[in-house]
Interface confidence: medium
């Protein structure tokens, strides 16, 4: 994905810009956007970026707020690229089981699970 | 989702069953399954469960290996439920920005990012 800066730096910069422009972004008090009700963020990337689109369409553009939305679109491109890589390589069952075990291990230790 | 045990316990039990049945599951040496090439597992749940389906259709069923696939199907139901909760509640921009900031924060600290 053609970004001038590495994705990790892009994320950091975007966090800073989000903080800078918060007052401008919350100016529309009637706007309602779907917000996930759990913290397993990666499951909700589609809805998050739809929300960003809604917000962008309601925000007066100009200056560094444009940079914020540009950055967010590059982050989306990065995530879309990662999603493409989910099914690109066919491997032996052994390697699939390693990945499945890793996935369940992460779910076991890192996910916020409400029963 | 009607499971007799909490999801967290279900995940633990499934990890154990996966380990128990590994030899049986890898018996088919010609089978190839798509394996994600990165560690952001939550982005790849669809492909992971498609892979499990491929594996199940090639595995001789019976005994506790059936329990493994049953468990995995309950985990899928849980994740599908979580995905539904991504867009269910409409909130103020303020709350959306909190979630977006949290998402980017997690991406910044926990994601495995290759540029």
């Amino acid at each position: 994905i053609p970004t001038e800066i590495p994705t990790s730096a892009l994320v950091k910069e975007t966090l800073a810009l989000l903080s800078t422009h918060r007052t401008l972004l919350i100016a529309n008090e009637t706007l309602r956007i779907p917000v996930p009700v759990h913290k397993n963020h990666q499951l909700c990337t589609e809805e998050i970026f739809q929300g960003i689109g809604t917000l962008e369409s309601q925000t007066v553009q100009g200056g560094t707020v444009e940079r914020l939305f540009k950055n967010l679109s590059l982050i989306k491109k990065y995530i879309d690229g990662q999603k493409k890589k989910c099914g690109e390589e066919r491997r032996r069952v052994n390697q699939f089981l390693d990945y499945l075990q890793e996935f369940l291990g992460v779910m076991n230790t890192e996910w916020i699970i409400e029963s | 989702i009607p499971t007799e045990i909490p999801t967290s316990a279900l995940v633990k039990e499934t990890l154990a069953l996966l380990s128990t049945h590994r030899t049986l599951l890898i018996a088919n040496e010609t089978l190839r399954i798509p394996v994600p090439v990165h560690k952001n597992h939550q982005l790849c749940t669809e492909e992971i469960f498609q892979g499990i389906g491929t594996l199940e259709s090639q595995t001789v069923q019976g005994g506790t290996v059936e329990r493994l696939f049953k468990n995995l199907s309950l985990i899928k139901k849980y994740i599908d439920g979580q995905k539904k909760k991504c867009g269910e509640e409409r909130r103020r921009v303020n709350q959306f920005l909190d979630y977006l900031q949290e998402f980017l924060g997690v991406m910044n600290t926990e994601w495995i990012i290759e540029s």
């Epitope: - | 499990i52 259709s57 595995t59 069923q61 019976g62 899928k76």
Partner: nanobody
């Protein structure tokens, strides 16, 4: 202990009908993909009809339009309604099941009944 027991076979004239039943014990039909197989003397065993865990139904070409597979989850029974029977339908018919939670393809059947004989005379 899983058991599949077939019944309903018998002798019938060409053009007649039979209804085969397969009662399952030790498993619930909600959790399984099922199929009817048949084997005629000196011939390959073939899958006649199948019903997946998600209710998708498939038929072998020679029986399409004549045979109907169904299941009654409450009775834990699968059926095969056979109409317009032909002499070439003569075979031992058996039912088979496998618990599948993800895949609808029935590559491996774990459980199978003893079978019921169907004889069609011309």
């Amino acid at each position: 202990q899983v058991q599949l027991v077939e019944s309903g076979g018998g002798s019938v004239q060409a053009g007649g009908s039979l209804r085969l039943s397969c009662v399952a014990s030790g498993l619930t039909l909600n959790d399984v993909s099922m199929a009817w197989f048949r084997q005629a003397p000196g011939k390959e065993r073939e899958e006649v009809a199948g019903i997946d865990i998600d209710g998708l139904i498939s038929y072998a070409d020679p029986v399409k339009g004549r045979f109907t597979i169904s299941k009654d989850n409450a009775q834990n029974t699968m059926y095969l309604q056979m109409n317009s029977l032909k002499p070439e339908d003569t075979a031992m018919y058996s039912c088979a099941a496998v618990r599948l939670y993800f895949s609808s393809s029935r590559n491996q059947y774990k459980y199978e009944g003893q079978g019921t004989q169907v004889t069609v005379s011309s």
